[in-house]
């Protein structure tokens, strides 16, 4: 119950906090549990105690073990345990699970990645940040105080992020690295009454007789994944499949495109070998979702051959 895991890499600084809290004026004693040996408070030692903190400057694999802290208050002593593991540095780029701090999630609106445990150290900006061992560069990445901000977060930004900083103790510098996973979650979606982007209401589409023509019905329905959303074409108020003209078919275009984060759908109406009678039909682009239905009507007109030649 009063135990906390801490880990670090050899030759890096590691500072551990006693799991028991008290007043600043309380004395805190530290012991190496296996030997019950008191940890010195003199800063000249590589491992020393400083109140609530136990400092390894730098850490060695042999420092691994359980450390006991006793917070001495006027009425009783509070005992806590710090389970410390120091690992050898990895030669490859992979950060093993046992070195990872808690995963954080971000979204388009909130993309802060805090550098784990940094509040324990005496560090100065800037922090260095790496993703999968590559130094982060470019205007999308901003190291701010103890966290990294990523602008315009995308799903590809998910991955393992490592912060690197220098701890200063009495003029001596020690490196510290810490890694955590970052996942990208969709912003909370919402649904709107459909908005038809194309065609315009009562648009006149010029076509050439004998040639093929395409009409695109495009509508947006809100943000995020939509529970129910559809776009379709009707001919004279009849579904394409029921109209019975094999020359006129509809096919889905770009499905659920998230440009600007909006959930949009396209439906393309393909008319093969345009005929005179096609000019007499009413073409309706329909967009519908749980909020209702919106309709834009298009008519075809013969393209003027003179315009064509010019």
């Amino acid at each position: 119950k009063f135990s906390k895991q801490s880990w670090g890499l050899e030759n890096e600084a590691l500072i551990v906090r006693c799991p028991r809290q008290g007043k600043p004026s309380y004395t805190v004693d530290w012991y190496y549990s296996q030997t019950n040996k008191s940890i010195p408070t003199q800063e000249r030692n590589r491992v020393f105690a400083s109140g609530q903190l136990l400092k390894f400057l730098p850490a060695a694999v042999a420092d691994s073990g359980i450390y006991t802290c006793i917070v001495r208050s006027p009425t009783f002593n509070r005992t806590g345990y710090a389970n410390v593991t120091i690992y050898k540095k990895q030669s490859d780029c992979n950060v093993p699970d046992y070195l990872m701090y808690s995963t954080v999630s971000g979204s388009e609106k909130n993309s802060k990645i805090y550098c784990p445990t940094i509040d324990l150290y005496n560090w100065t900006a800037p922090l260095e940040w790496f993703k999968n061992c590559q130094a982060l560069q470019g205007s999308r990445y901003r190291a701010h105080k103890s966290f990294l901000v990523i602008d315009n977060v995308m799903t590809e930004d998910a991955g393992d992020y490592t912060c690197k900083f220098i701890h200063n103790e009495n003029g001596a510098n020690y490196s510290v690295t810490a890694t955590r996973s970052f996942t990208v979650k969709d912003e909370q979606g919402f649904s709107l009454f459909p908005v038809i982007g194309a065609p315009a209401q009562n648009e006149i589409k010029e076509v050439e007789i004998g040639k093929n023509a395409n009409l695109t019905c495009s509508a947006c329905f809100g943000k995020g994944t939509q529970f129910l959303a559809a776009v379709l074409w009707q001919l004279n108020g009849t579904k394409i499949t029921d109209f019975g003209e094999p020359r006129i078919q509809q096919e889905e275009g770009q499905n659920q495109s998230f440009s600007n984060g909006l959930a949009c759908l396209d439906m393309v109406l393909r008319i093969a070998d345009v005929k005179e009678e096609d000019l007499l039909l009413q073409y309706d682009c329909l967009a519908l979702n749980l909020h209702g239905l919106r309709r834009h009507t298009v008519r075809l007109s013969r393209k003027n051959p003179i315009d064509h030649h010019s």
């Epitope: 906390k4 007043k23 600043p24 006027p74 009425t75």
Partner: antibody
Amino acid sequence: QVQLVQSGAEVKKPGASVKVSCKASGYTFINYGMNWVRQAPGQRLEWMGWINTYIGEPTYGDNFKGRVTITRDTSASTAYMELSSLRSEDTAVYYCAREGDGFAYWGQGTLVTVSS
Amino acid sequence: DIVMTQSPDSLAVSLGERATINCKSSQSLLYSGNQNNYLAWYQQKPGQPPKLLIYGASTRESGVPDRFSGSGSGTDFTLTISSLQAEDLAVYYCQNDHSYPYTFGGGTKVEIK
């Protein structure tokens, strides 16, 4: 600068529960415990309990044991105090106060009124 | 529980004069481990949370004017305002900061004579 910002006033019926939040900023939340103190109208200050914000271990005053629950959310740097089975004498201003040698930092207070 | 008894309940003092508030605890607040007396003093004005003035019986909190001073050890403690100012009108509380449950005195209201 250190700030403790508490949730707004509440009106509750006898027998109900109330949960008050205390959002900390300007310092590392898990470095200091958080106390809860209440003050009924015209009464002395009364300590309810505190929580070790690092490991989440609460300690309660005997007068409130069984009725009070103190929790914390480290990711939100927020401490919570929930008081159940409310009675009219629980009408008071409830404060959070950061642990230290004395309580140097207090929330602005949350007035909880218990009335039928 | 440690009982904190303050006296007087109220105190009327002329501006510029000395105000003295006493606090007695039912058990010693001295911790032999570090020789600290775990007693705090607070000032509270209407509609505001208490403000820490003194901790450790005699250590002034940063930003507190030096006209406020604390003294005492063990079970008997005193808060002194050496030269009362208009802004010092408030209720003053002592607090057992030694052991759970932390307990407060009943308060002393300081008024202008």
